[in-house]
Each structure stands twice: as C-alpha cells, then as structure tokens.
C-alpha cells in the first residue's frame, strides 16, 4: 500500500468501455468443488475511484451499521472510522451496537504516509454482497487519524486481508479473514478483480459504476480468460512473492534477480502504483524512456508528479512498451510471466484546465521497501489469493483495459533456474520497526 499514498488507490468501471473484452477461453484446470464456479452474488461488489481505493460494503454491529470498506491486501487490521471526521459521511457508532465488546486496548498504525489510532474491540460483521455469514471479528475503532481518510473517496474503513504477522499491535490480533474461515465453512481463499476505468471518473460516475469483484471463498470463471497461473506465497505476512525476471517490450532488464525482490515483493490492492526498488525503477524508467523516445516527456512525468495530456482519443498507446514480470512457478525451475500494458501503468487523471484532453500520470514509482504490485498490476488480472495452498494465481482479467493491438497476458511455462536465489532474506529486526506498507 504505497506510492505517495500507499493505501488509497484507484478503480473504475467494470466494463472497459475504451477497450475490448476478450472472449472466454476454456479453463484447463480441474474443478475443485465448492471453490470454483459461479459466485453471482459477489460479482461486481466493489466500487471505487481512480487512485483512491476499491471498497466493499460491509455491515458492523447489531443492528447492522453499513460502511464502505477499502479492500487492502497489504495490511492485516480491520479498522473503521469511529468518530466524526471531515471526510467521513458516516462512521461506526459502537454505543449503538448491542454486540460490541471492548477489548480495552489501543492500537496505532503508521503507514509510509498517513496514520491512525483507535480502540480495539469485537463485533458482528457481515458482507452483504459476500458469503451469507456473520462473524465476530476484531475491529479497530479509529478515533484519531492523519492523512488517512481521503476526501471524496466514499470509504470509511479498511479491511486488511494479509496475515496476522503484520497485524497491529501484534500478531495475536486475529485478522478478519482468519476469523471468517475459522467461524464458517468459507474456504480459505479469496480472489480480486480490480477494474480500471481507462478514464477518470467523477463522483456520480463512481457511485454508479462497478469497480470490480471480491469473490470470498472461491474463483469465478466469468472474471478471467485463459488459464490461472500460480506463484508460491513465499512467507505468510504480506502476500510475498518472488519475481525472477523483468522485461520491457521483451527486453530483459538483466539485473541480479535479488534486486527485483529487495527487500520483498508483495501483492497489494491498497497501493495505487507498481512500486519498484530504486535500482530496478531507474533501469525500468531508462528502458521505458528509450522505448517511447518518439515523444519527449518532462522529468516530472517519470517521477509521477506531472501529468501528460493528449487530445481526447489520441493517446499514443503504441509508443509505450509492455512490461513483463516473471514470477516463480509452482514447479521447480518453472516460471510464468504476467504482462501489463501502458493502459495499466498510465493512470488516467482529470486535468481541470483541459478537460477535453486525456491526461495521465506515470503510475510506476520508486520504493525503499521492495516491489509493490499495486493496482497498476492488479487491474490487468484476476488475482486469486489461495491461502489454503499458500499460492497466488494470476489470469487475464475479463475487465482489463486494452486496445485492438495488445492485451495483458499471463503466459508460461518458462524455464528459469535458481529461482530461490532471487528471494531476499530480510535481517531479523525488532517487530516494532515494521512499517505497514503504504506510501
């Protein structure tokens, strides 16, 4: 959950009105009863706004209080606004819930940018457009925050879907998804289809639009095309994976693969950008600049600070390269690659001065905490967080934005040796020095 804002990220329409939807391909994987198939009630249950996060509706307490909750695979606390705040339309009122239990404990969560603190308790929680269950879950009632809530984002809390190891104040605080699996028959996996709009959305468009789907307990065939390819979860804290090779327009960056994962690589729905370690970022930008050299862009664009605009409908997608990340496969010496388009890594933003133009920010940025595969990556793919089998699956998203010439891709297998050597072993430091991702 990073960039200049880690958590707040982006979303958009479910369709891809500017692009094409790919036809369904046959799924070559065997059926797993109860885990794959149709989850109609959960499809299209996410909404959001460009750069500000994908959220799901949840209810908390008795009688139920409805809140929009940001879906964040880069943290592990379920936390909701519980006091008035200028950017919140509504908040959790514990005193109105007959099922609230105070844990008499406080919690403080700092992100790279933004922080919050609050009081821990438990209450009954359900997801209206999710499994038909109610669970008693830990809730952090946010009473004080700084640069956390976003004006106009329409969400009032955060659902941290990662593992207990990074929960605050410590790993004894059971995350929501663990509680869900423990208390119900919901299988231990979820999948996310984040759908970028391909163009900026105003407030009313966001509220009317679909931002994607969070399928709890399963995999929905209608949300992806082709096959799902799985990469191991290296360690159950963040959703940590290993990148073994990076290509820009098919050209290998030729770096020691440890650099790609220094000091970790994570899949984080709460981060807007694709964030890359300093050396990797510099090499990638150099390569992207070279590939797109038919047009010159200011330095501020590559730093994610300045917009670039083209006359409506004239964005020269073809001059920008595709980016491929090769991920460790499930089989020894086997990898697969995921490929994103400029339609994913150029983020549409509104330029008030020239609203007739199509304007974009470069959504790849530098990181000091490793690679973060944020929305820029996830908007190209249907991503399966298969916690039960300690793996993450990628398939081409049925809603990704593309053009008639190129599409996002998930391809394999490729032979890659010594992939274990690509992982970086973080020196064991005091747990309190951990920064929850965000940026």
């Amino acid at each position: 959950t990073q960039h200049g804002i880690r958590l707040p990220l982006r979303s958009g329409l479910g369709g891809a009105p500017l692009g094409l939807r790919l036809p369904r391909e046959t799924d070559e994987e065997p059926e797993e009863p109860g885990r794959r198939g149709s989850f109609v009630e959960m499809v299209d249950n996410l909404r959001g706004k460009s750069g500000q996060g994908y959220y799901v509706e949840m209810t908390v307490g008795s009688p139920p209080q409805t809140l929009n909750i940001l879906v964040d695979t880069g943290s592990s606390n379920f936390a909701v606004g519980a006091a008035p705040h200028p950017f919140l339309h509504r908040y959790y009122q514990r005193q109105l819930s007959s099922t609230y239990r105070d844990l008499r404990k406080g919690v403080y969560v700092p992100y790279t940018q933004g922080k919050w603190e609050g009081e821990l308790g438990t209450d009954l929680v359900s997801i209206p457009h999710g499994p038909n269950v109610t669970v008693r879950a830990n809730i952090a009632a946010i009473t004080e925050s700084d640069k956390f809530f976003i004006n106009g984002s329409n969400w009032e809390g955060i659902l941290g879907l990662a593992y207990a190891e990074i929960a605050r104040p410590d790993d004894s605080l059971e995350p929501f998804f663990d509680s869900l699996v423990k208390q119900t028959h919901v299988p231990n996996l979820f999948s996310l289809q984040l759908c970028g709009a391909g163009f900026p959305l105003n407030q009313s468009e966001v509220l009317a639009s679909v931002g994607g789907s969070m399928i709890i307990g399963g995999i929905d065939h209608s949300l992806y095309t082709g096959s799902l390819w799985y990469t191991p979860i290296r360690r159950e804290w963040y959703y940590e994976v290993i990148i073994v090779r990076v290509e820009i327009n098919g050209q290998d960056l030729k770096m020691d693969c440890k650099e790609y994962n220094y000091d970790k690589s994570i899949v984080d729905s709460g981060t807007t950008n694709l964030r890359l370690p300093k050396k990797v970022f510099e090499a990638a930008v150099k390569s992207i600049k070279a590939a797109s050299s038919t047009e010159k862009f200011p330095d501020g664009f590559w730093l994610g600070e300045q917009l670039v605009c083209w006359q409506a409908g004239t964005t020269p997608w073809n001059i920008f390269p595709v980016i491929s990340l090769y991920l460790m496969g499930e089989v020894t010496n086997q990898s697969f690659r995921i490929t994103i388009l400029p339609q994913q890594y150029l983020r549409p933003v509104e330029d008030v001065a020239t609203s007739q133009d199509d304007c974009y920010k470069f959504a790849i940025s530098q990181s000091s905490t490793g690679t973060v595969m944020g929305a820029v990556i996830m908007e190209g793919f249907y991503v399966v967080f298969d916690r039960a089998r300690k793996r993450i699956g990628f398939a081409v998203s049925a809603c990704h934005v593309h053009d008639e010439f190129r599409t996002a891709a998930v391809e394999g297998p490729f032979v890659t040796l010594d992939m274990e050597d690509c992982g970086y072993n973080i020196p064991q430091t005091d747990e309190s020095t951990l920064m929850t991702g965000r940026a």
Epitope: D102, R104, G106, E117, T143, D170
Partner: antibody, heavy 124, light 107 residues
C-alpha cells in the same frame, strides 16, 4: 521551555464539583496528547484520564468514568478536567502531563513533562 | 485491569552500588511499559519508555529491559540524586496502570 500549570484545586464537599485547568506553553498544544494523573497523599500514582491531540479520543480510569470529563481548548492552550460527584477517595494531587505526540498509542508517545500539580481535597 | 507488581517495595543501597528494580505485569503488556522517577515534593519524570529506551537527558547509568510480563530497571552505579521512588506504568490495556512503586533509599 515546556510549562504546564495546573489550577482549580481546593476543598470541596462529597458530591460536589470542581473544574481543574492546565495552562500549557512552550509547545504547539494541539499537536500533543494530554493526560491527568493523580496521587493521593502518601500513596502511589493513578492514571485518571487522557485525550488525543485533537480531543477526538478520550479515555478514563474505571474509578472516574461517568463522573469526570476531560476536555481541551486548543485555541486557549488549556486542558480541563471537570470533576462531578466527588468522593473522599478522589482526594489527591492532580497532575497534568504532556504526551510525546498527538497520539496516545504511538511508540515513544509517553507523558512527560508533568506540571507541579494541584491539590483536591474532598471532605465534609 | 492489568496489575503491575513492583519489587522490592524498598531498596536500601549505598551510592556507587547497582540497583535492580523489578516490575511484573499480570498479563503481557508487550513493550508498552515505562519507568518514572519521583522525588519528594516533585512531579514524576520519565526515565525509560517502551521498556528499554532512555528518555531525553537521562544519564546512561539508567537502563531498562524486558518485554511481555517481566521488566527490569537497572541503575548501574547509584548517584546521590538517584535516591527516589520509581514507578513502572503500562499503556497496553485500559485502564493504564502504575505499579505501587519502589523506594530506593540510602543505606
């Protein structure tokens, strides 16, 4: 230099009320959590109440909950403790203390320095 | 509530000696524990925070250790100004609670 000056203490009958004030100077008051701690004569320290920098979070010891109210006026750089339904066991020196940040739970955000205290005596 | 038990209640030592004060919590407080020093007629002052970090301006002879339920404040070589009452306090759980104090007196 940080200065905290408590006032408002005195003798009050059981069941009565008092309002303590803590005038702060030497720091940006609204950027820091604040707390009240008391010490009965010849006894140890007892935490009473705390509030975050904005005043959005307030907490109380069980012994005073429902009777005491902590508040702050950041424009006046002043912390308050409204004490109602006072009991003999509330007799103590009441100290106000500055937090290490606006946060109540952040690592390192402990209370220091403290004022010199104001004596509250509840007796008939 | 979490009960903090300090021992010994009184510690009689001479200047230059090493003082070891104990604070035991009835349940884990992680490292959310601090030590304060109070001299007669004065307000308490922060010595150690988050179990082991010295507060600004506190001499190196003061050190804190421990986590979970057992904590120690050590004064490596007592100076005359160190004779005072020492309190531990936790803010892991509500209500925040102080220990009963340890008085370090001149032998």
């Amino acid at each position: 230099e940080v200065q905290l000056l408590e006032s408002g203490g005195g003798l009050v009958q059981p069941g009565g009320s008092l309002r303590l004030s803590c005038a702060a100077s030497g720091f940006t008051f609204g950027s820091y959590a604040m707390s009240w701690v008391r010490q009965a004569p010849g006894k140890g320290l007892e935490w009473v109440s705390a509030t975050s920098g904005s005043g959005g979070s307030t907490y109380y010891a069980d012994s005073v909950k429902g009777r005491f109210t902590i508040s702050r006026d950041n424009s006046k750089n002043t912390l308050y403790l409204q004490m109602d339904s006072l009991r003999a066991e509330d007799t103590a020196v009441y100290y106000c203390a500055k937090g290490g940040s606006q946060w109540l739970y952040a690592p390192g955000s402990w209370f220091d320095p403290w004022g010199q205290g104001t004596l509250v005596t509840v007796s008939s | 509530e979490i009960v903090l038990t300090q021992s010994p209640a009184t510690l009689s030592l001479s200047p230059g000696e090493r003082a070891t004060l104990s604070c035991r919590a009835s349940q884990s407080v992680s490292s959310y524990l601090a030590w304060y020093q109070q001299k007669p007629g004065q307000a308490p002052r922060l010595l150690i925070y988050d179990a082991s970090n010295r507060a600004t301006g506190i001499p190196a002879r003061f050190s804190g250790s421990g986590s979970g339920t057992d904590f120690t404040l050590t004064i490596s070589s007592l100076e005359p100004e160190d004779f005072a009452v020492y309190y531990c306090v936790q803010r892991s759980n509500f209500p925040w609670t102080f220990g009963g104090g340890t008085k370090v007196e001149i032998k």
